[in-house]
Amino acid sequence: LTCLGGFASPGPVPPSTALRELIEELVNITQNQKAPLCNGSMVWSINLTAGMYCAALESLINVSGCSAIEKTQRMLSGFCPHKVSAGQFSSLHVRDTKIEVAQFVKDLLLHLKKLFREGQFN
């Protein structure tokens, strides 16, 4: 994590690049998973609709002691227009449903791949 994704060239990059890098990180997490991800920690499920980046971070920021998802948290923080705090919940959370972080990541990955295919980069 030391170089935090490497150094990008100056100036804005296409939104597709940011989404692609997030997808690549989620793929890395799912493929490199040996033991249960984040020791099987549970997080609130979210509605994968508009505002899902903030909702996803609001769920994942409550997971501590799990270095595997730190880079994902950092990426997501930039997709959400406001600062997200632990313990903060939006209306996009399915508050009665908790799932394992591993399943959360898989669901998010599938949805982001769909958005990427459809060209919905923002």
Epitope: T2, C3, L4, A8, V13, A18, N62, G65, A86
Partner: antibody, heavy 117, light 113 residues
Framework: EVKLVESGGGLVRPGGSLKLSCAAS????????MNWVRQTPEKRLEWVAS???????YYSDSVKGRFTISRDNARNTLHLQMSSLRSEDTAMYYC???????????WGQGTSVTVSS | DIVMSQSPSSLAVSVGEKVTMSCKSS????????????LAWYQQKPGQSPKLLIY???TRESGVPDRFTGSGSGTDFTLTISSVKAEDLAVYYC?????????FGSGTKLEIK
């Protein structure tokens, strides 16, 4: 209300040791990266060390091998064990929240460390 | 390490004037994975701890007056105070949190005439 309170500073001789602590309250401590930052007598700010919510640890080259950062999530406390202290470690030491997802949004009032014979 | 350079080192202005200060980094601070510049501005008033003003180069921290504006991208950044108040007397530091080790500029001291 987020609060960070440092303690443990003081006067120590070169080569000596000191342990700083930072008591955190008002937020979910375990979910945040935490940092130690020092301010030299010349008022320069120097990042010292970070410990992420996931347990990753980072040090500045100037303290690597001499300082150890740790956290006790059960007690909401951040620590900095300093050994082999040098005169150039003389500074005000602050603990600060986050720095990884966002910038360092909350700082303590600082604790003063003086290394002198 | 990323070197942060601030200028000027100090400036004196009258209340109501507009102030701009510069911060340059030796490496790009734009993280391609989310298109954010990992650059922060802090204000340190005499006898106090640093206080976060701006993060992501241009996002004001909650509670910070809108006379403070951060701008820039890549390696060149600016903090602007649109109309200085007496209470803005402080040292202003920029800091990169793009990669470890985090590094700070040497500060710009704002004095009131």
């Amino acid at each position: 209300e987020v609060k960070l309170v440092e303690s443990g500073g003081g006067l120590v001789r070169p080569g000596g040791s000191l342990k700083l602590s930072c008591a955190a309250s008002g937020f979910t401590f375990s979910s945040y990266a935490m940092n130690w930052v020092r301010q030299t007598p010349e008022k320069r700010l120097e990042w010292v060390a970070s410990i992420s919510s996931g347990g990753n640890i980072y040090y500045s080259d100037s303290v690597k091998g001499r300082f150890t950062i740790s956290r006790d999530n059960a007690r909401n406390t951040l620590h900095l064990q300093m050994s082999s202290l040098r005169s150039e470690d003389t500074a005000m030491y602050y603990c600060a929240r986050d720095g990884y997802l966002y910038a360092m949004d909350y700082w303590g009032q600082g604790t003063s460390v003086t290394v002198s014979s | 390490d990323i070197v942060m350079s601030q200028s000027p080192s100090s400036l004196a202005v009258s209340v109501g004037e507009k102030v701009t200060m510069s911060c340059k980094s030796s490496q790009n601070l734009l993280y391609s994975s989310n298109q954010k510049n990992y650059l922060a501005w802090y204000q340190q008033k005499p006898g106090q701890s640093p206080k976060l003003l701006i993060y992501w180069a241009s996002t004001r921290e909650s509670g910070v007056p809108d006379r403070f504006t951060g701008s820039g991208s890549g390696t060149d950044f600016t903090l602007t105070i649109s109309s200085v108040k007496a209470e803005d007397l402080a040292v202003y530091y920029c800091q990169q949190y793009y990669s470890y080790p985090f590094t700070f500029g040497s500060g710009t001291k704002l004095e009131i005439k």
